[in-house]
């Protein structure tokens, strides 16, 4: 288990970010609605490289589009509240990457669907958590 308190804090924040992303993906996968087809037409920018915490800048820059797409899904069977959820993710991302970062995100040439986008960032969180555990 992580030894330093800063590592423990980082791990906990990454676990929370991971859970938030998994909750969104689960909500979308469970979503039986014509709006889902429309959601899948929205394109997200993917990071060229995502191996360090500073690369979360690329996720931060896509949070507004993510919120907009999730707003489409609102119904009695979609229980994620986009504003609260994205606000929580934003807070975690800022804490993890640091608000002082000057890192400029580089994006891949190909865009992705919301499902591919979420899977990419879920994998990112899982891979960093694994190195901390």
């Amino acid at each position: 288990a992580p030894t330093s308190s800063s590592t423990k804090k980082t791990q906990l924040q990454l676990e929370h970010l991971l859970l938030d992303l998994q909750m969104i993906l689960n909500g979308i996968n469970n979503y039986k609605n014509p709006k889902l087809t429309r959601m899948l037409t929205f394109k997200f920018y993917m990071p060229k490289k995502a191996t360090e915490l500073k690369h979360l800048q690329c996720l931060e820059e896509e949070l507004k589009p993510l919120e907009e797409v999730l707003n489409l899904a609102q119904s009695k069977n979609f229980h994620l509240r986009p504003r609260d959820l994205i606000s929580n993710i934003n807070v975690i991302v800022l804490e993890l990457k640091g608000s002082e970062t000057t890192f400029m995100c580089e994006y891949a040439d190909e865009t992705a669907t919301i499902v591919e986008f979420l899977n990419r960032w879920i994998t990112f969180c899982q891979s960093i958590i694994s190195t901390l555990t």
Epitope: M23, N26, H79, D84, I122, Q126
Partner: antibody, heavy 113, light 107 residues
Framework: QVQLVQSGAEVKKPGASVKVSCKAS????????MHWVRQAPGQGLEWMGI????????SYALKFQGRVTMTRDTSTSTVYMELSSLRSEDTAVYYC??????WGQGTLVTVSS | DIQMTQSPSSLSASVGDRVTITCRAS??????LAWYQQKPGKAPKLLIY???SLDEGVPSRFSGSGSGTDFTLTISSLQPEDFATYYC?????????FGQGTKVEIK
Amino acid sequence: QVQLVQSGAEVKKPGASVKVSCKASGYTFTRYYMHWVRQAPGQGLEWMGIIQPRAGYTSYALKFQGRVTMTRDTSTSTVYMELSSLRSEDTAVYYCTSGWDVWGQGTLVTVSS
Amino acid sequence: DIQMTQSPSSLSASVGDRVTITCRASQSISTWLAWYQQKPGKAPKLLIYAASSLDEGVPSRFSGSGSGTDFTLTISSLQPEDFATYYCQQSYSFPVTFGQGTKVEIK
């Protein structure tokens, strides 16, 4: 110490609803997401869903979607799981768990006419 | 959904025996696997997380290994208090899923 204390056993009729509570103590309530898991008599463990206690947003297993509602009261550090349109196969022990290493003692819900 | 398959579903062993329980995932879950012990009338207790990390306070006779799709829980020398049902669980993706359980009984 860190603990989760759940409400007592319930007996319900088919078609009714049940609301189980889970009160957290010994840690910052909003710091850990809460899962609900159930276990039918003599059966295995089944994940029902998750709630983020600070903001209260949720995500449910497809099997329970439309019947389950998870809520929380931050003032009392309590999470609730309500299951509606109960049927006999919902007879089970319902557990809340925070971070998977801390579990409530379980609440037996019996559905019988 | 990711299916988790445990084997055997039950086993009989004696105190001091080395016991091995396996768990197979229907797709790769990296090391996002946990093992739980459950005794009758009690809540599950976390033994191992991240496939091989021992939770706090868990005796060192318990160990976990594996990654990808195949995982193992080993009890190096079975003690009287270890007779229980053991479950594996994946948290790689939602919905979280559990194995069907392995009951370890006294021979």
